[in-house]
Amino acid sequence: QVVPPYGSENQTCRDQEKEYYEPRHRICCSRCPPGTYVSAKCSRSRDTVCATCAENSYNEHWNYLTICQLCRPCDPVMGLEEIAPCTSKRKTQCRCQPGMFCAAWALECTHCELLSDCPPGTEAELKDEVGKGNNHCVPCKAGHFQNTSSPSARCQPHTRCEDQGLVEAAPGTAQSDTTCRNPSESLPPEMSGTMLM
């Protein structure tokens, strides 16, 4: 097992993830592991010397960087909130705040916007990827209603008048609940279906 530093005539190293080619000395040297940086470069007689990243800084990968990356907070102006804090090995993890979706992606989400309202008679389709896309409004299924403009309101089942000992006065629609009345209440004239012969 050859350990760094070792000579390399073809400018390639055995383990590209954990080693790098140093052209000045024509040798392969160790990279520094995640959470560390190069505090002293390698030479023919000594391998790379690594040091731990200072507080509020990180390096995610095996590297030969002479500095660590500065931790950045999740930007609330962009609608982002923290999932997990920055450590020496990873940057701050962010997501969209509740009621928002990711409107702009780089490698990660960079900008969140408010979810669109779903109009009466519809509801937001439930997604696996909550917050990663805007609402897609779908009609309430039969026997259900939703009577507000809202990004999160769910369609509710129509009231069953008979369950309450009442009778239906007006049927429910996608935008309104069933109207019930007492069986003893007389129907208004326009709703009376009785014809005298």
Epitope: I83, K91, Q93, C109, E129, G133
Partner: nanobody, 120 residues
């Protein structure tokens, strides 16, 4: 535990094409943001492209825009990187990575990598 296995690397001439595949197993990947990274000899690891599992939120590094395309096939739990008009500077080990939170701020699962060499 999640496993990512890359394939499709190899030797190609400048101007040629390759398609890399990343097969994911061990869990449902519905919520995962997937990405391709690469590490060229003597360089730091860099992100090349990323995609959400609904196909949205795609990202490309400036150096590959218009030449590389990331896509996914949910039925096969596989992510692809179509690489066209390859250049010698695209020579690198290409790694597939998954972010289990889906937000792309920390890729916690990695494949072993597949070597792409662009040379005449």
């Amino acid at each position: 535990e999640v496993q990512l296995v890359e394939s499709g690397g190899g030797l190609v001439q400048p101007g040629g094409s390759l398609r890399l595949s990343c097969a994911a197993s061990g869990r449902t990947f519905t919520n995962y943001r997937m990405a391709w990274f690469r590490q060229a000899p003597g360089k730091e690891r860099e992100a090349v492209a990323a995609i959400n599992w609904n196909g949205g939120g795609t990202y490309y590094a400036d150096s590959v825009k218009g030449r590389f395309t990331i896509s996914r096939d949910n039925a096969k739990n596989t992510v692809y990187l179509q690489m066209n008009s390859l250049r010698p500077e695209d020579t690198a080990v290409y790694y597939c990575a998954a972010d289990s939170t889906g937000w792309g701020s920390y890729f916690d699962y990695w494949g072993q990598g597949t070597l792409v060499t662009v040379s005449s």
